[in-house]
Amino acid sequence: FNISGCSTKKLLWTYSTRSEEEFVLFCDLPEPQKSHFCHRNRLSPKQVPEHLPFMGSNDLSDVQWYQQPSNGDPLEDIRKSYPHIIQDKCTLHFLTPGVNNSGSYICRPKMIKSPYDVACCVKMILEVKPQTNASCEYSASHKQDLLLGSTGSISCPSLSCQSDAQSPAVTWYKNGKLLSVERSNRIVVDEVYDYHQGTYVCDYTQSDTVSSWTVRAVVQVRTIVGDTKLKPDILDPVEDTLEVELGKPLTISCKARFGFERVFNPVIKWYIKDSDLEWEVSVPEAKSIKSTLKDEIIERNIILEKVTQRDLRRKFVCFVQNSIGNTTQSVQLKEKRG
């Protein structure tokens, strides 16, 4: 199809080489078409028509994304050629940064419902650059945490080194939806709730004498509880003796509950005590079996191919530790009688 009639938007993604970050493009179709596809209507309160166009189709997947190769080759369907780019409804997610993401991206409706729709498309020219500005050492992260129940703020990474007075007007989106009243480089949240978690996008316009473009950054926000003040609990084993059959294989499980920590370095390991000797056992990797906002339960097993007489004289000790402290639970094996 002919893309010369597409509306054009220029975007800049400046990524930090120090951190993983994502990027998104929205399919900003011109009015009234976009409303029938993406529910991304941008009407100001004064422009709302009598019959709201976003009452149209509720199928949010009926747009097609293409990339325009720089060598003039035909348009390429994003889904077929770019595994690190994911289409989610009307949003294109770039999972990894890199200058190779630079290029022209085109979106248009899949279903052509009227002659006007043929020209209904948007071309987004994306320029991707690594961040070179060393003067801003403490720019905001692309991953930010908000403490539930307290006051918090979400900062726009590309503007976090500017004062509020210097900052241009920012447009914020949460999960692809416009947060129309938030216009500064920082959203202040009076009290943090679960729903504040999500993907935030901040946009502002930059221009030179020739043209203007949108500078965009994406922030993943998670809502968290305060760091635990407790050392981990061992949930299993509970008993300090375990009846076993000699010559049979045996698996002993250690399950421990770790409270939430922002910097989480849990330790869970098995070691064996035999008279005055003790040594750590190489056992299968620990695995998380349940994770909630407040805590995580981690399990690690010790496997004996067959229980020997010598094992009955040993103590098998599970050791768990977090930044607060450690807990141990020892198990003595006892031969089953009759």
Epitope: H39, N41, R42, P45, L52, N58, L60, N175, K177, Y195
Partner: antibody
């Protein structure tokens, strides 16, 4: 024709539980909408309970007084439920389901543009 | 939670008269306020959204104004059909997690 219909109301004993269901027809839930529950005690005003973001992301707004006893959930592309526990006589009311229209915004800047007829919940021994 | 305070609780005016209902929010909700009309035995009906925009099919005798924390609904050229209870509602939940209603104003048309 776009419609919301509430079901599940009835007589329940104090300290009992009840689950109300809101069923949509003529439209399906999408990221343009929040689906909400509002109640009205006999002869009293409207009291907002909770809203859930209809796209399935799990975002929920809930009145402070309702937290812990009332749980809103999206159960399909056309149904939302309200689970109510530890009910008392003060919970006797008509419970309405409504659609909050967000358009391309995050919040329901276009108001609650569609309402069900309501279902009566009576808490009495 | 945000608190919406509506005044007066009740008002009585003759046919052809004008009624003014005020609504105050406990924090700024910008222009994100709706007004509803409810008649006995019926669910509420949306009249106005974004403080001043008439919902589809609502006659121009209803007028909404205000922003921030103070809002007004004016009903002019009162008709018998306008006898109902009117409610305001905050539609800005991001900062408060709340879509609270005002206490309601009963309008009696004499």
């Amino acid at each position: 024709q776009e419609q919301l219909v509430e079901s599940g109301g009835g007589l329940v004993k104090p300290e009992g539980s009840l689950t109300l269901t809101c069923t949509a027809s003529g439209f399906s839930f999408s990221s343009s909408y929040w689906i909400c529950w509002v109640r009205q005690a006999p002869g009293k005003g409207l009291e907002w309970i909770a809203c859930i973001y209809a796209d399935g992301s799990g975002s929920i707004y809930c009145a402070t007084w309702a937290k812990g006893r009332f749980t809103i959930s999206k159960t399909s592309s056309t149904t939302v439920t309200l689970q109510m526990t530890s009910l008392t006589a003060a919970d006797t009311a008509t419970y309405f389901c409504s659609r909050g229209n967000a358009g391309s915004y995050w919040d329901i800047y276009y108001g609650m543009d569609l309402w069900g007829p309501g279902t009566l919940v009576t808490v009495s021994s | 939670d945000i608190v919406m305070t509506q005044t007066p609780a009740s008002v009585s005016e003759p046919v052809g008269g004008t009624v003014t209902i005020k609504c105050q929010a406990s924090q700024s909700i910008y222009s994100y306020l709706s007004w509803y009309q409810q008649k006995p035995g019926q669910p509420p009906k949306l009249l106005i959204y974004q403080a001043s925009i008439l919902a589809s099919g609502v006659p121009s005798q209803f007028k909404g104004s205000g922003s921030g924390t103070d809002f007004t609904l004016t009903i002019s050229d009162l008709e018998c059909a306008d006898a109902a209870t009117y409610y305001c509602q905050s539609n800005y939940g991001f900062s408060s997690g709340s879509y609270a209603f005002g206490g309601g104003t009963e309008v009696v048309v004499k």
